[in-house]
Structures are given as structure tokens and as C-alpha cells.
């Protein structure tokens, strides 16, 4: 708390300008009117206030707006945003994408702080869904943003927003998240032709079911091993050797290097050794010739 002291003669601020950077904390408190500060917030970010001075300015705004700042002030907070707590931000009602962009710009290059996470949460909840423009903005500033959302939150992402997603935005997504995103991506890209479709859908394939992988294997897509290794194990297991060969194309040779890792390891265990041998890669661990394979899950389903 800054003590209440009278403003020295001639020091009363008539506008927010560079002369204020030389005011001591108590002078700022005493000589800067909170209403003046609020109407001239756009100037604050253009003046190099010290960290302590910014604390005083924040205190003045808090006193003026105990229920939360109006958007006209929030929009121009600039570096003062970094002084806000999540509790402060929960009082805000941010509706403008421009306001969101302005505040994210201030935090650019930093990790996503609790303040930013709260700001985004307030903004998205206010909008009701994660629309394309918002998603575009958020992933531009925080490539990992999408993967920080729960599957429930991701379900509110409209398929049209998927166009904004870049491959690196999905790097940290887990299978549960991709399960939600994949059907949306499939819907979003459904009108594209084969090769273009594959380029777009590739990053989402960690959520693809077996039947879609089988369909892709008929389209000469030449999936790389990195993508294959991210596929759902349960989706890969039913694929035949011929289907995997078609799916991977020239990349099929990479299976040898990955034969001890999932999903390749588990897939090998489900294939006939005879079939694996046709690949000529020396993959071992398949079902020996002459053995009968019983699909117990199918049997249970029939009974």
C-alpha cells in the first residue's frame, strides 16, 4: 500500500507523459488522477515506467475499478498486463479479439503464464466456442495451445477452425485429444483431393480409426514412419501386411528400425510370419506358419 500524501505544488499530472517516469512512488500516487490514467492508458505503454511505478499505476486502476477493468482500459494495458493476477483477470469481460491480441503480444516469447491462461479462458467462455479467428490467434502465439485443452473443451472447436491448425500445433497432443480432433479435421478437409487431403490430415491421424487407415492405404500416400508411429495401436493392429506396405510405400523399410516399439511391435505380433517375410526386412516375432489365429474378441461378440 502506498501512503496517502498531498501532491507537491506544481506536480499535479495534467496528462500521462514522460515526465512521470521521474516521479517517486508516493508522487505518482498523489499526483496522478486515476480517471486521467484510465482515459490515457494508451500512453502508458509508450512510457518506460519502472516496475515499482507500474505497481502504483495498477493500484490506482484497482481502486477506480474494484469490480474489474472495462475493456477500453484492458485493451491498452500493454506491459501493465504482466502485473495482473489471475484473480484480477477473472473480473474482466474481454470480447474483442483485438484486445486479446494486444495482451498476448505483451507476453510474446514467454511461457503461457497463469494470467494468460485465465485471459484465454475468459475470452473463449465469453465467445461460447473456439472459432477460427480465435484459434488462429492463439496458436500463432502459443503453438501448443490446442493440446493444453481437455477433450471436452476441444469438442467445442468447430470443424471450420481446423483450417487454422498447423502440424506443430499438435506436437504435444495425446491420443485422447486427437480422437476428438480427427473427425473434425476429416470433415473440414473432406472436399480436398487425395494428395492434398493427406497433407492436411496427416497431423491428425493419431486419432484415425482402422477403416480410415485402410482407405488411405489404397491412395498411394507414402506415410512417413514418424506419422505411422503416432497412430493408435488399436487402429494399426487389424491392418494387414499388404495394407501397411501400401500405406508406407517406400518408407516401409523404416519398420525394421522400429520393430521393438509400439505400435510396430504389437502389429508384428499379430501378423503371420510368412506375410512379414514378404517385406524382406527381416522382421521377426510374427505368428509361426501353421498356427491358427482365433480372434477372441470376435467370438465374444458373436456369442
Amino acid at each position: 500500500e502506498v501512503e496517502k500524501t498531498a501532491c507537491p505544488s506544481g506536480k499535479k499530472a495534467r496528462e500521462i507523459d514522460e515526465s512521470l517516469i521521474f516521479y517517486k512512488k508516493w508522487e505518482l500516487e498523489a499526483c496522478v488522477d486515476a480517471a486521467l490514467l484510465a482515459t490515457q492508458m494508451d500512453r502508458v505503454n509508450a512510457i518506460p515506467f519502472t516496475y515499482e511505478q507500474l505497481d502504483v499505476l495498477k493500484h490506482k486502476l484497482d481502486e477506480l475499478y474494484p469490480q474489474g477493468y472495462p475493456e477500453s482500459v484492458i485493451q491498452h494495458l500493454g506491459y501493465l498486463f504482466l502485473k495482473m493476477s489471475p484473480e484480477d483477470i477473472r473480473k474482466w469481460n474481454v470480447t474483442s479479439l483485438e484486445t486479446l491480441k494486444a495482451l498476448l503480444e505483451v507476453n510474446k516469447g514467454h511461457e503461457m503464464s497463469p494470467q494468460v491462461a485465465t485471459l484465454i479462458d475468459r475470452f473463449v467462455k465469453g465467445r461460447g466456442q473456439l472459432d477460427k479467428d480465435t484459434l488462429d490467434t492463439l496458436t500463432a502465439f502459443y503453438p501448443g495451445y490446442l493440446c493444453s485443452l481437455s477433450p471436452e473443451e476441444l469438442s467445442s472447436v468447430p470443424p471450420s477452425s481446423i483450417w487454422a491448425v498447423r502440424p506443430q500445433d499438435l506436437d504435444t497432443c495425446d491420443p485422447r485429444q486427437l480422437d476428438v480432433l480427427y473427425p473434425k479435421a476429416r470433415l473440414a478437409f473432406q472436399n480436398m483431393n487425395g494428395s492434398e487431403y493427406f497433407v492436411k490430415i496427416q497431423s491428425f491421424l493419431g486419432g484415425a480409426p482402422t477403416e480410415d487407415l485402410k482407405a488411405l492405404s489404397q491412395q498411394n500416400v507414402s506415410m512417413d514412419l514418424a506419422t505411422f508411429m503416432k497412430l493408435r495401436t488399436d487402429a494399426v493392429l487389424p491392418l494387414t501386411v499388404a495394407e501397411v506396405q501400401k500405406l508406407l510405400g517406400p518408407h516401409v523399410e523404416g519398420l525394421k528400425a522400429e520393430e521393438r516399439h509400439r505400435p510396430v511391435r504389437d502389429w508384428i505380433l499379430r501378423q503371420r510370419q510368412d506375410d512379414l517375410d514378404t517385406l524382406g526386412l527381416g522382421l521377426q516375432g510374427g505368428i509361426p506358419n501353421g498356427y491358427l489365429v482365433l480372434d477372441l474378441s470376435m467370438q465374444e461378440a458373436l456369442s
Partner: antibody, heavy 121, light 109 residues
Framework: QVQLVQSGGGVVQPGRSLRLSCAAS????????MHWVRQAPGKGLEWVAV????????YYADSVKGRFTISRDNSKNTLYLQMNSLRAEDTAVYYC??????????????WGQGTLVTVSS | EIVLTQSPATLSLSPGERAILSCRAS???????LGWYQQKPGQAPRLLIY???TRATGIPDRFSGSGSGTDFTLTINRLEPEDFAVYYC??????????FGQGTRLEIK
């Protein structure tokens, strides 16, 4: 072009005083805050003091507070540093520097040539 | 008090190589309050970078600044003979008002 020409350095005994000057030209001196920065022999840079464009506000590093006084005469386009009660640890090259704050990213965009102050008995 | 720690203390490289100089702050600082200076023997410092990444007037584009929070970097691509000097990072806004790193000496290998 912008120029900051310094004078007033020299050898002085501990406890004595010295006044440094920095004559500015090539810009509107009265529109800029000015600083003094020093550098002990073979050492790094150390900020000393700042004065606002109109001379009404001053800040000092703790190491010189109460002993050094920064001032300016805008009619003469000159910055001063009055150094009293000098100590051996004040031995350094002293630089005056113009402070560019208009971009909100404060930086010293022009420096004087430096003047050596040696405090020795 | 915000302390700036520069590393390495000395960097030995040849002309044409790339120099990467680090400046670490003891606590998170605003990017717009972080600058870099070059000082050659017997000369005053010269402003290179302000706002962590903005080149000052007349500074060649082989100099670039980056970073945020506590970690900042000055990169000099394709070193020229005149680039061998001492480099200081500087921060404004704390107490004391202005602090400098201890400097990195860039010398010819």
C-alpha cells in the same frame, strides 16, 4: 551531429571534490534526460545518476548517494556531476550519456568520450 | 535487485564465425527494458540493440538480439575484424534504476 564533450577529470586526493562537465550540441538538450555512467579500470560499466530533462528530478546509485550531485544548465546545454567526499573506489572513467526514451525502450543512444577521475593520496 | 549475468566471460572466435552471447537476469524482466552495447578499448560504449531485439540506427544486420523473461541472447553472424570488443547487456526499470552485466569479451582466436 550529436556531440557530448566531457571535461573536468583529473587526479584528486581522497575526501576532496571534483566537478565534471558534459557540453552537448547537435540536439535539443532540454528535451532529453541525461545520465552519468562510470567504469573502473579494467572493470564493467556502472550506472551513477540520472537527471530529468528539466532538472527537477534526480536519481542516484546507492554507492554515490549523498556524495554526488547531478545537475544541468539548459541555457548552456551542459550537464554536471559534482563529486564530493571522493574515495579510492570512485576511481574510474566517467561517461555522460543521452537517454533515448521516446520509443518507450530506454537506451543510451549517445555517449561522451569519457573523462578519467583518479582518487589517490 | 535484478542482477544480469553474462556468459561466457570470454569468447574466442575467428572472423567469419558466429558469436552467441548470453545474458541471464536473476528474475523475469520486460523485453523492452533490455539492451546491448559494444565497447572497444579506449572508446565509449555504443548502443547496438534496444527492446531486446531492435537494432539501433546504423547497426549492421549481422547483429541480432532475442530472448524474453530471464534469458537473452546477442548473436553476431559472420564476425568482422571490427566486431572484436567487449559486449554488455543492460536493464532498466528496477532498483538500481539501471544495471549492466559484467560483460563478455569477444577476442580473435
Amino acid at each position: 551531429q550529436v556531440q557530448l564533450v566531457q571535461s573536468g577529470g583529473g587526479v584528486v586526493q581522497p575526501g576532496r571534490s571534483l566537478r565534471l562537465s558534459c557540453a552537448a550540441s547537435g540536439f535539443t538538450f532540454s528535451s532529453y534526460a541525461m545520465h552519468w555512467v562510470r567504469q573502473a579500470p579494467g572493470k564493467g560499466l556502472e550506472w551513477v545518476a540520472v537527471i530529468s530533462y528539466d532538472g527537477s528530478n534526480k536519481y542516484y546509485a546507492d554507492s554515490v548517494k549523498g556524495r554526488f550531485t547531478i545537475s544541468r544548465d539548459n541555457s548552456k546545454n551542459t550537464l554536471y556531476l559534482q563529486m564530493n567526499s571522493l574515495r579510492a573506489e570512485d576511481t574510474a572513467v566517467y561517461y555522460c550519456a543521452r537517454w533515448k526514451v521516446s520509443s518507450s525502450s530506454p537506451a543510451f543512444d549517445y555517449w561522451g568520450q569519457g573523462t578519467l577521475v583518479t582518487v589517490s593520496s | 535487485e535484478i542482477v544480469l549475468t553474462q556468459s561466457p566471460a570470454t569468447l574466442s572466435l575467428s572472423p567469419g564465425e558466429r558469436a552467441i552471447l548470453s545474458c541471464r537476469a536473476s528474475q523475469s524482466v520486460y523485453t523492452k527494458y533490455l539492451g546491448w552495447y559494444q565497447q572497444k578499448p579506449g572508446q565509449a560504449p555504443r548502443l547496438l540493440i534496444y527492446d531486446a531485439s531492435t537494432r539501433a540506427t546504423g547497426i549492421p544486420d549481422r547483429f541480432s538480439g532475442s530472448g524474453s523473461g530471464t534469458d537473452f541472447t546477442l548473436t553476431i553472424n559472420r564476425l568482422e575484424p571490427e566486431d572484436f570488443a567487449v559486449y554488455y547487456c543492460q536493464h532498466y526499470g528496477g532498483s538500481p534504476l539501471i544495471t549492466f552485466g559484467q560483460g563478455t569479451r569477444l577476442e580473435i582466436k
